[in-house]
């Protein structure tokens, strides 16, 4: 009953593949290897990720699960979604934040923190774009507001106002009384 | 903590037969494959069996195959060595290992002597 | 059969030395190969498994390489509890083959 190598596994079923001697199933997603199978297409020995470890996919090899992330409290991240045995906790802003990038190449798993959204109102502007992947972006001055240097200014509310030229294209029809 | 005791060792005349243990403790037995490996005296090691977790699979060295048969009580935590037609040149200390290719636990060895 | 060439069969170093032992297979056997040391009248004790992995509670001063046909094993510092024989052992496939051991003493 000598063993030969098999170069691909002659096994019914998916999932197999050589561990050592044998070829072998695999462990599904949230479980670990505890033991490698020990005849030929067997099932080998799994086991449930702990808690605060997950493994997201089907593995032959993992003898650990891996550690959930922890979100940043000090980058003012938050648990969108919490971790379990299949998946890694989803870190990010809580509503009225947006992820700021710590690298220019921003992938998915970058480095970020949380960075509170513009308040166009506040700042007496239109919401041209909602704030969620980036900053709000604020559009133009709310009516009854002019652009003066960064900012909106109110009209004035008399003639005694000093009106510039600008205010006066905005606000013009209230110089007439 | 894991233990394996190997016995049954001693003396035999050439052509004679004997029945090694190793009892094993510390660990779900039931889930490991098993070995026997041997070491003459001064020499190197020699893998001679191997027995799959539930027993349905066995393997042996060519040096051993038709002599030797492996097998194991799962209910009793206990692996066994029946040796038939024993030969000078099968004296060596036997161990039993945990694993299934890999070895992580041996037991201390028992000596055979086969000698007329 | 696998055949599992180790050398030197054995070495002489001193203790803080760097020692080194190789094992060729006479195959390909991936990375399925362990490292075993072997004190007189003790049985072997893995160190290292799929040729690089080192085995809980051994000392970091032990690693391994290799892949394929030739491997290695290192020692970075020897020390004087070192002495022992080791042996590497292909598990890619039966018969299990060991290699024929490499002796270790203190110069």
């Known amino acids: 009953q000598g063993g030969t190598r098999s170069p691909r596994c002659d096994c019914a079923g998916d999932f197999h593949k050589k561990i050592g001697l044998f070829c072998c199933r695999g462990c599904p997603a949230g479980h670990y290897l505890k033991a490698p199978c020990t005849e030929p297409c067997g099932n080998s020995t799994c086991l449930v990720c702990p808690q605060d470890t997950f493994l997201a996919w089907e593995n032959h090899h993992n003898s650990e699960c891996a550690r959930c992330q922890a979100c940043d409290e000090q980058a003012s991240q938050v648990a969108l979604e919490n971790c379990s045995a299949v998946a890694d906790t989803r870190c990010g802003c809580k509503p009225g934040w947006f992820v700021e990038c710590q690298v220019s190449q921003c992938v998915s798993s970058s480095p970020f923190y949380c960075q509170p959204c513009l308040d166009c109102g506040a700042l007496h502007r239109h919401t041209r774009l909602l704030c969620s992947r980036r900053d709000t972006d604020c559009g133009t001055c709310l009516p009854g507001f002019y652009e003066h240097g960064d900012g909106c200014v109110s009209c004035p509310t008399s003639t005694l106002g000093s009106c510039p030229e600008r205010c006066a294209a905005v606000c013009g029809w209230r110089q007439m009384f | 903590e894991v233990q394996l005791v190997e016995s049954g060792g001693g003396s035999v005349q050439p052509g004679g037969s004997l029945r090694l243990s190793c009892a094993a403790s510390?660990?779900?037995?039931?889930?490991?494959?098993m070995s026997w490996i041997r070491q003459a005296p001064g020499k190197g090691l020699e893998w001679i069996s191997y027995?799959?977790?539930?027993?349905?699979?066995?393997y042996y060295a060519d040096s051993v195959k038709g002599r030797f048969t492996i097998s194991r009580d799962n209910a009793k935590n206990s692996l066994y060595l029946q040796m038939n037609s024993l030969r000078a040149e099968d004296t060596a200390v036997y161990y039993c290992?945990?694993?299934?290719?890999?070895?992580?636990?041996w037991g201390q060895g028992t000596l055979v002597t086969v000698s007329s | 059969d696998i055949v599992m060439t180790q050398s030197p069969s054995s070495l002489s170093a001193s203790v803080g030395d760097r020692v080194t032992i190789t094992c060729q297979a006479s195959?390909?056997?991936?990375?399925?190969l362990s490292w075993y040391q072997q004190k007189p009248g003790k049985a072997p004790k893995l160190l290292i498994s799929?040729?690089?992995n080192l085995e809980t509670g051994i000392p970091s001063r032990f690693s391994g390489s290799g892949s394929g046909t030739d491997f290695t094993f290192t020692i970075s510092s020897l020390q004087p509890e070192d002495i022992a024989t080791y042996y590497c052992?292909?598990?890619?496939?039966?018969?299990?083959?060991f290699g024929q051991g490499t002796r270790l003493e203190i110069k």
């Open positions: 290992a945990r694993g299934s290719g890999s070895f992580d636990y």
């Open positions: 510390g660990f779900t037995f039931s889930s490991y494959g």
């Open positions: 027995i799959s977790s539930s027993g349905g699979h066995t």
């Open positions: 195959q390909d056997i991936t990375n399925y």
């Open positions: 799929d040729a690089s």
């Open positions: 052992q292909q598990y890619d496939t039966l018969p299990i083959t």
